[in-house]
Interface confidence: medium
């Protein structure tokens, strides 16, 4: 059998084996050692007994999408049946005081590989036995502590494979410079040691994406906006746009990144090198927000122009740094360009990312202020509580709801929350009456809300003892 017979041939992209070599990977046309690494089809009954106490689940994740040329990292984590874990020596042990369906285990080990390897090898002391090899026959690398690594991971993508000895968690990084744009499939098969052979315990696959677009995400925040995820914002208040570029391998670390904004409100283009920008819409309506991100990234060199007929001696080729635009897929696309092969040449290519959103601008409550507080004197004094009127003004749209949150002086421990509908005239002047239990200092958060906005003001107040002569004080506004 060959690797591609064992590892599956599912192909999300039409091109495959004619692929550029991934660095350190091997062709899946190579032979697979089925004696050491048995191959079981899906549904084979042997899977049921491949692991003591249940099935092992492999979870494969990646930091996809990857900008072409950057590194993409894949991580595989093994999840063992309940009450099982890997110890410091790489053995699989039962967790102390953990009860599974079989109850508490008397034997601390699920798999004691240390004991196996000590009495199984007969190896001439080098560790180079015929069974310490990968499925293609390559010997295991003898890093310090390699004997504690009891899982063999075989990664397979793009008609190539990569073998790795590891513990219950491994990571593999792949450079995407030679990978065709679009979705690709990564498949991983995991084996465990079993005496002098190996047993398959899990198979997993995941899609990853290679793109020539800079992956761009934009978060939008506006003070007083009630729901930040509905793309509805308020007129006359700045919106903060924050651009996050997904670049986990730091491919663009040394690139100058330019952000070109069009807010769709006839304010023109705004170009910045800062990933955050504030913009205030002064009209209601629906606007098309467009962002283009541009970065000069390391990339393939364009083909050189045809050389002129030399009339003079040609100067020697120095190391060059070139830059050119790419709006269409370049060498990583489906029709690879012939690349120039100038030694040590260091070219750059302008990569772009785009973000577009339709945002709705509406009236909202822009500001709220407490302009006066009055202690309400009651005919019969209540020994334990005070009634206080807050006179509140607001700007913007008319609120439909008022909430007061009364808490301790640090504003952290809430003591009382009261919300009530309000009917306010266009002057937006209202009185909110609240009860305070006993004297002391209180933090008061007062919010006015409508369907789209929520405006807040806070104040610290000192409520005196029930001595009518004691004035009410606003401690801090």
């Amino acid at each position: 059998k060959r690797f591609h017979d064992v590892l599956g041939n599912e192909r999300p992209s039409a091109y495959m084996r004619e692929h550029n070599q991934l660095n350190g990977w091997s062709s899946d046309e190579n032979d697979w050692n089925e004696k050491l690494y048995p191959v079981w089809k899906r549904g084979d009954m042997r899977w049921k007994n491949s692991w003591k106490g249940g099935r092992v689940q492999a979870v494969l994740t990646s930091d996809s999408p990857a900008l072409v040329g950057s590194n993409i990292t894949f991580a595989v984590n093994l999840i063992f049946p309940r009450c099982q874990k890997e110890d410091a020596n790489g053995n699989i042990v039962y967790e102390k005081n953990c009860r599974n369906e079989a109850g508490l285990s008397a034997d601390p080990y699920v798999y004691n590989w240390t004991a196996w390897s000590e009495d199984s090898d007969g190896e001439n002391g080098t560790g180079q036995s015929h069974h310490n090899v990968f499925p293609d026959g390559k010997p295991f690398p003898h890093h310090p502590g390699w004997r504690r690594w009891n899982f063999i991971y075989v990664f397979h993508t793009l008609g190539q494979y990569f073998q790795k000895l590891g513990r219950c968690s491994v990571r593999v990084s792949v450079n995407t410079a030679n990978v065709t744009l679009g979705p690709q499939l990564m498949e991983v098969t995991v084996y465990r040691r079993h005496g002098r052979a190996y047993v398959p315990i899990a198979q997993v696959k995941d899609v990853y994406v290679v793109t020539d677009q800079i992956p761009v995400f934009v978060t939008m925040f506006q003070k007083n906006d009630r729901n930040s995820s509905d793309e509805t914002f308020l007129k006359d208040l700045p919106i903060m746009f924050d651009v996050l570029i997904h670049d986990p391998s730091h491919f663009l670390n040394y690139s100058t990144i330019n952000y070109k904004w069009s807010f769709g409100d006839n304010t023109g283009l705004f170009v910045s090198t800062n990933h955050t920008v504030n913009h205030t819409y002064v009209l209601n309506g629906t606007f098309s927000l467009n962002l283009t991100v541009k970065a000069a990234a390391p990339g393939p060199c364009p083909p050189p122009p045809p050389p002129p007929r030399p009339s003079k001696p040609t100067p020697s080729l120095a190391t060059t740094l070139k830059s050119y635009d790419s709006n269409t897929p370049g060498p990583a696309g489906d029709n690879p360009l012939e690349l120039s092969r100038i030694p040590d040449e260091n070219c750059q290519i302008n990569r772009y990312g785009h973000f577009q959103a339709t945002i709705t601008i509406v009236e909202g409550i822009l500001e709220v202020n407490i302009i006066q507080m009055t202690d309400v004197l009651m005919p019969v004094p209540w020994p334990e509580s005070s009634l206080i009127d807050f006179v509140v003004t607001c700007q913007g749209s008319i609120p439909t709801e008022v909430c007061t949150i009364i808490s301790d002086p640090t504003c952290e421990i809430t003591q009382n929350t009261v919300c009530s509908p309000v009917d306010v005239d266009e002057m937006c002047l209202l009185t909110v009456r609240r009860t305070f239990n006993g004297s002391g200092t209180y933090c008061v958060n007062l919010t006015l809300g409508d369907d789209t906005s929520l405006a807040l003001t806070s104040t610290l107040i000192s409520v005196p003892d029930r001595d009518p002569a004691s004035p009410l004080r606003m401690a801090n506004s």
């Epitope: 599912e10 999300p12 065709t180 679009g182 979705p183 899609v207 994406v209 696309g333 785009h354 577009q356």
Partner: antibody, heavy 119, light 108 residues
């Protein structure tokens, strides 16, 4: 809100080529985590996935139709297109364009266009 | 390719009653399964993904369950707007993405 709209002739003669275009609005076709698919629904039968295209031009078609299917993309117009050659009466169906999310499922669909193959 | 089989082909239910639709895969698709609803003259609408997660805006009366080869879509109390055709689709092994042939939920 993303919207997709199919357009093209509703009647095609046998052995000719069916051509449809899907126009995407409310979102860019040049997005790295979406793929753009054609799916058809034969009268009285289930849905059949025809093929997809990625903004870069990478395509993949259902092996059952592969030799007859061509899918192309025009990012400047935010459109992608399907051509199906050598059609027969068995290709009579409602044709949908759809946005595929992360190579998993189809989260937005066009309204569909009925294509009848008849002489 | 993975073949998806839905049963029954037609389900007659009275409004307010519970409807249970079944979808079977010819081999395991883990939980990589979605359900769509399609009304006459309309495009399919995404209901459930990941076998059990409701899509945005889908009412709580729709629930999905199952893993491997057997899946169920349950509508706890049928409303008049729920009478439609329901399709399942796997996205575990692709391409191609494959769909069931549909279950029509009609008024009893």
């Amino acid at each position: 809100q993303v919207q997709l709209q199919e357009s093209g002739p509703g009647l095609v003669k046998p052995s000719q080529t069916l051509s449809l275009t899907c126009t995407v609005s409310g979102g860019s076709i040049s997005s790295f985590n979406y793929y753009w698919s054609w799916i058809r629904h034969h009268p009285g039968k289930g849905l059949e996935w025809i093929g997809y295209i990625y903004y870069s031009g990478s395509t993949y078609s259902n092996p059952s139709l592969k030799s007859r299917v061509t899918i192309s993309v025009d990012t400047s117009k935010n459109q992608f297109s399907l051509t199906l050659s050598s059609v027969t009466a068995a290709d009579t169906a409602v044709y949908y364009c759809a946005r595929g999310y992360n190579w998993n499922y189809f989260d937005y669909w066009g309204q569909g266009t009925l294509v009848t193959v008849s002489s | 390719e993975i073949v998806m089989t839905q049963s029954p082909a037609t389900l007659s239910v009275s409004p307010g009653e519970r409807a249970t639709l079944s979808c079977r895969a010819s081999q395991s698709v883990d939980n990589n399964l979605v359900w769509y609803q399609q009304k006459p003259g309309q495009a399919p609408r995404l209901l459930i993904y990941g076998a059990s997660t409701r899509a945005t805006g889908i009412p709580a009366r729709f629930s999905g369950s199952g893993s491997g080869t057997e899946f169920t879509l349950t509508i706890s109390s049928l409303q008049s707007e729920d009478f439609a055709v329901y399709y399942c689709q796997q996205y575990n092994n692709w391409p191609p993405w494959t769909f069931g042939q549909g279950t029509k939920v009609e008024i009893k």
